[in-house]
């Protein structure tokens, strides 16, 4: 369960892949599309509002009873829109929604390789946001593979602003 309904902190950042491609968001036919692309030098990176929430582990998972806590994150590139996992389609989509946000909008934050992050679906443990064919997709990660796969690694570049932006 998420501890409390308000985030413990928020930050504004641009999101890029392990290979330094930018994650961008474009409004097309009244819905948002998500792209993974090389940005032209003068093009500004898209910003994402990351809201961080604490969540208690189910004690059976963590082996440490009530002590175990996870850090969950929601990602919003523009007002009222959040990244969501579509587990049936193995896709990552932007949906307009109101709070309280659905579970599909929450991702467990992992630090994997040092100074890279990964986003694991709250609704589907072992499934991560990843890059596939220049798009974001849901990728199942085999824990025996040590979770090092570069296609699920992302870099966050903090932007010193505190208010939600509007596209």
């Amino acid at each position: 369960s998420i501890t409390g309904i308000s985030p413990i902190t928020e930050s504004l950042a641009s999101l890029s892949t392990y290979n330094d491609q930018s994650i961008t968001f474009a409004l097309e036919d009244e819905s948002y599309e998500i792209y993974v692309e090389d940005l032209k030098k003068d093009k500004k990176k898209d910003k994402v509002l990351l809201s961080y929430y604490e969540s208690q582990h189910p004690s059976s998972e963590s082996g440490d009873g009530v002590d175990g806590k996870m850090l969950m994150v929601t990602l919003s590139p523009t007002k009222d829109f959040w990244l969501q996992a579509n587990n049936k389609e193995h896709s990552v989509e932007l949906h307009k929604c109101e709070k309280p946000l659905p579970d599909q909008a929450f991702f467990v934050l992992h630090n994997r390789s040092f100074n890279c992050v990964s986003f694991e679906c709250k609704t589907d443990p072992g499934v991560f946001i990843g890059v596939k064919d220049n798009h974001l997709a849901l990728i199942k990660v085999d824990y025996s593979e040590n979770l090092g796969s570069e296609n699920i690694l992302f870099k966050l570049s903090e932007i010193l602003e505190h208010h939600h932006h509007h596209h």
Epitope: S62, K69, R112
Partner: antibody, heavy 122, light 107 residues
Framework: EVQLVESGGGLVQPGGSLRLSCAAS????????MYWVRQGPGKGLEGVSG????????YYTDSVKGRFTISRDNSKNTLFLQMNSLRAEDTAVYFC???????????????WGQGTLVTVSS | DIQMTQSPSSVSVSVGDRVTITCRAS???SSWLAWYQLKPGKAPKL??????SLQSGVPSRFSGSGSGTDFTLTISGLQPEDFAVYYC?????????FGGGTKVEIK
């Protein structure tokens, strides 16, 4: 109850080796980011080496790279720091610490051991 | 590496006083800052994480604030057991660097 107990410290000559252990109980070691931190005599805290829970990725501060190796034995729920080619400036109390959150170091380190003293001197 | 500049390096205060310790990061670290208390011969104790979240079991006289690059630890109504050395640590990116420490001593 979460507990971390370090051992393996002692007096060693420059160029020598030591292996520090950190026995963890009350939680699953592999689920958390673990970190070795040291405090030299009359000095502040310095992060030495870390290991990521889920990926097992490792980190070393520049001054120990190539000399120290962090590892863990999941079956024994124990963290290790193998210290080779020790120098006088490695003299310190070494603490092991566990992250607040199970998959990230963003929240800092909630549980610490009492520390083990490493003295490098001839 | 991110440099953490902590001030003052020491402060002499009386029981009941309010103490403010500041920490400045050399680059933006969002709210990823922790504060620790260290007493001789004891394990460091986490007081505040994520800049302002009070660690469970820590008295409410301890509070943290700030984001970006500037952060503050405040002890309101210092108690005898609060005389110790306090460290900030940026937990945003490796290496996870500490400030130089602030010694809070009895006046």
């Amino acid at each position: 109850e979460v507990q971390l107990v370090e051992s393996g410290g002692g007096l060693v000559q420059p160029g020598g080796s030591l292996r520090l252990s950190c026995a963890a109980s009350g939680f699953t070691l592999r689920s958390y980011v673990m970190y070795w931190v040291r405090q030299g005599p009359g000095k502040g805290l310095e992060g030495v080496s870390g290991i990521s829970g889920s990926s097992g990725g490792t980190y070393y501060t520049d001054s120990v790279k190539g000399r120290f190796t962090i590892s863990r034995d999941n079956s024994k729920n124990t963290l290790f720091l193998q210290m080779n080619s020790l120098r006088a400036e490695d003299t310190a109390v070494y603490f092991c610490a566990r992250s607040v959150y199970s998959t990230t170091w963003y929240g800092g380190f909630q549980h610490w051991g009492q520390g083990t003293l490493v003295t490098v001197s001839s | 590496d991110i440099q953490m500049t902590q001030s003052p390096s020491s402060v002499s205060v009386s029981v009941g006083d309010r103490v403010t310790i500041t920490c400045r990061a050399s680059q933006v670290i969002s709210s990823w800052l922790a504060w620790y208390q260290l007493k001789p011969g004891k394990a460091p104790k986490l007081l505040i994480y994520a800049a302002s979240s009070l660690q469970s079991g820590v008295p409410s006289r301890f509070s943290g604030s700030g984001s970006g690059t500037d952060f503050t630890l405040t002890i309101s109504g210092l108690q005898p057991e609060d005389f110790a050395v306090y460290y900030c640590q940026q937990t945003n990116s490796f290496p996870l660097t500490f400030g130089g420490g602030t010694k809070v001593e009895i006046k």
